[in-house]
C-alpha cells in the first residue's frame, strides 16, 4: 500500500451564515493522526503513536496549515449561492500519496451536505463532476469562485500538492511510521449458533500495517469465501487495526478447524478452543471513530466521509 496523508476539513453554515471555526482531521497511512482542537485552536496528535512521529517537535506548522485551509474553506462556503435555511456543510478531502516506485498521486474532493459534487486530480489538473444537476450547479458555483480568487490558480494547487507531499515525507522520516510493524493479537472464540452447530470467530487486533490475511481452514485447507463472514479492517483508535472472520461449523468437528493469520511476512494458526461452548453476548464491535465530531454530525444527520 502507498504511504498517504489525508486532510479532512469541514465548515458549517446556519441560515446562510458561515459559522466561525472548522472541523479538521488528518489521517496518516489511513490512521487518525491529527485533529484540530477548536477550544485550543491547535492541531493535536491523535494518540501516542502520532506524538511519537514528531517526537519533541511542536505542531505549529500543522496548526498554521489547518487554520489556513479552514479559512479558505469558509470563504468557499460563503460563495455557494442559494443556501437554504438550516444547517449546511462543506467538506474538503485532500489526499496525497507516495507509492513504492516513488511516484506520487494527489486529489481533492468537495462535498456539500455530505454529497460529492467536485473532484480534482491535481497531477492531470482534471476536474470531475457527478451527473446530478445539484452537483453540476454547486460545482459551477465553487469553480467560478476559485477562478476569481487569484490564489486558486494552477500554481496554487501544485503548491498545495507539494506541501502535502513535503509533510508526508517529513512524517515518513520517522521510523515510527516507516518501519512500524505491530503483530496482531489473535483470539478464537466459539458461540452456540443452532442445534448441532457453533459459530467460531477469529479476531485479530492491535496490528499495523493494515494488510492482513485472516481465514478459516478445515483440515489445513482454506474454506471458500461464501462459507465465511469477514469484518472490515478498522482502526481501533490506538494507531493500529482490528478485524475478524467467522464461520459456522458442526459441533464435535472443532479439531478440524484452525484460523490462519498472515501479517507482514509472519503467519500463525490458531485452533478452536475445546470445552464448554461460550455464549457470547455481543459480536466483534464495528467501531467507527469520529473522534468527537460524531455528535455534531450525528445530530445534524450530515454524512461524514471516511
Amino acid at each position: 500500500e502507498p504511504h498517504s496523508l489525508r486532510y479532512n476539513l469541514t465548515v458549517l453554515s446556519w441560515d446562510g451564515s458561515v459559522q466561525s471555526g472548522f472541523l479538521a482531521e488528518v489521517h496518516l497511512d489511513g490512521q487518525p493522526f491529527l485533529r484540530y482542537d477548536r477550544q485550543k485552536c491547535r492541531a493535536k496528535p491523535q494518540g501516542q503513536w502520532a506524538e511519537d512521529v514528531l517526537g519533541n517537535k511542536t505542531w505549529d506548522r500543522e496548526t498554521r496549515d489547518l487554520t489556513g485551509n479552514g479559512k479558505d474553506l469558509r470563504m468557499t462556503l460563503a460563495h455557494i449561492k442559494d443556501q437554504k435555511e438550516g444547517l449546511h456543510s462543506l467538506q474538503e478531502i485532500r489526499v496525497c500519496e507516495i507509492h513504492e516506485d516513488n511516484s506520487t498521486r494527489s486529489s481533492q474532493h468537495f462535498y456539500y451536505d455530505g454529497e460529492l459534487f467536485l473532484s480534482q486530480n491535481v497531477e492531470t489538473e482534471e476536474w470531475t463532476v457527478p451527473q446530478s444537476s445539484r452537483a453540476q450547479t454547486l460545482a459551477m458555483n465553487v469553480r467560478n469562485f476559485l477562478k476569481e480568487d487569484a490564489m486558486k490558480t494552477k500554481t496554487h494547487y501544485h503548491a498545495m500538492h507539494a506541501d502535502c507531499l513535503q509533510e508526508l515525507r517529513r512524517y515518513l522520516e520517522s521510523s515510527v511510521v516507516l518501519r512500524r510493524r505491530v503483530p496482531p493479537m489473535v483470539n478464537v472464540t466459539r458461540s452456540e449458533a443452532s442445534e448441532g452447530n457453533i459459530t467460531v470467530t477469529c479476531r485479530a487486533s492491535s496490528f499495523y500495517p493494515r494488510n492482513i490475511t485472516l481465514t478459516w481452514r478445515q483440515d489445513g485447507v482454506s474454506l471458500s469465501h461464501d462459507t465465511q463472514q469477514w469484518g472490515d479492517v478498522l482502526p481501533d483508535g490506538n494507531g493500529t487495526y482490528q478485524t475478524w472472520v467467522a464461520t459456522r461449523i458442526c459441533q464435535g468437528e472443532e479439531q478440524r478447524f484452525t484460523c490462519y493469520m498472515e501479517h507482514s511476512g509472519n503467519h500463525s494458526t490458531h485452533p478452536v478452543p475445546s470445552g464448554k461452548v461460550l455464549v457470547l453476548q455481543s459480536h466483534w464491535q464495528h467501531h467507527h471513530h469520529h473522534h468527537g465530531l460524531n455528535d455534531i454530525f450525528e445530530a445534524q444527520k450530515i454524512e461524514w466521509h471516511e
Epitope: D219, V221, S222, R256, S268, T269
Partner: antibody
Amino acid sequence: EVQLQQSGPELVKPGASVKVSCKASGYAFTKYNIYWVKQSHGKSLEWIGYIDPYNGGTVQNQKFKGKATLTVDKSSSTAYMHLNSLTSEDSAVYYCATTDGYSLFTYWGQGTLVTVSS
Amino acid sequence: DIQMTQTTSSLSASLGDRVTISCRASQDIGNYLNWYQQKPDGTVKLLIYYTSRLHSGVPSRFSGSGSGTDYSLTISNLEQEDIATYFCQQGNTLPFTFGSGTKLEIK
C-alpha cells in the same frame, strides 16, 4: 518448488519401532499441514493423520491411534512419524504430503518403504 | 467411514483415446472429491481437487465432474505418460478415504 524428501527404506523386526522423516523445502514449513498416508503392498491408500507444524496440533484416523505418533522439528523443517509395536500388517510404503492451502495432499514425498520381518 | 468405490480396477485404452474413470462414494460428499495419479515408480501427484478444479501444472486433457455420490475423471486424449494408477479420495468427512484405484494400461 515445493519438495518433500523422505527417509530411506527400513527393515525392522516385529515388536520394534521406526521413525520415518519427511524434510520439507521450497515453502514456509509452518504455514501448511503435513499429512501421512499408508499404502500396503498392491493395495489402496489409507490416511493416517495430519499435523499442524506451527503448533504441533494433530488429527488422526482412529485406526492409527496408538500406532502412529506425529511430530515436527521446526528448526529443520522436518516432520516425523513414529510407528511402534510393529507387525507384518505395518509393512507398507508410507507417504508424507502437504497442501497449498487450497487442496488436500497437494504435494507428495517419494514414499518410504517399511518392511517388518524377523 | 465413507467407502469410495472404483469398480474398474484396470482399464486398457489406445493412445489418443478418451478415457473415463468413475468413482462412487457410499454417501453424499458434497463435491469434496480429489483425484491422484500414481506412476509405476510410486510417485504420486494431485490432478484434480474439489471435483473439477485442475491443479496447477496438470495438462488440460484431464478433467473432473460429478456431484453427490458419483464422480468421474476424464482424460480426453490419452498419452503414453498417462500410464498410471488413478485414485479418487473424499475430503468431506474424517477419516479421509481413497478408492481402490484404477490401473490404466495401453492396448
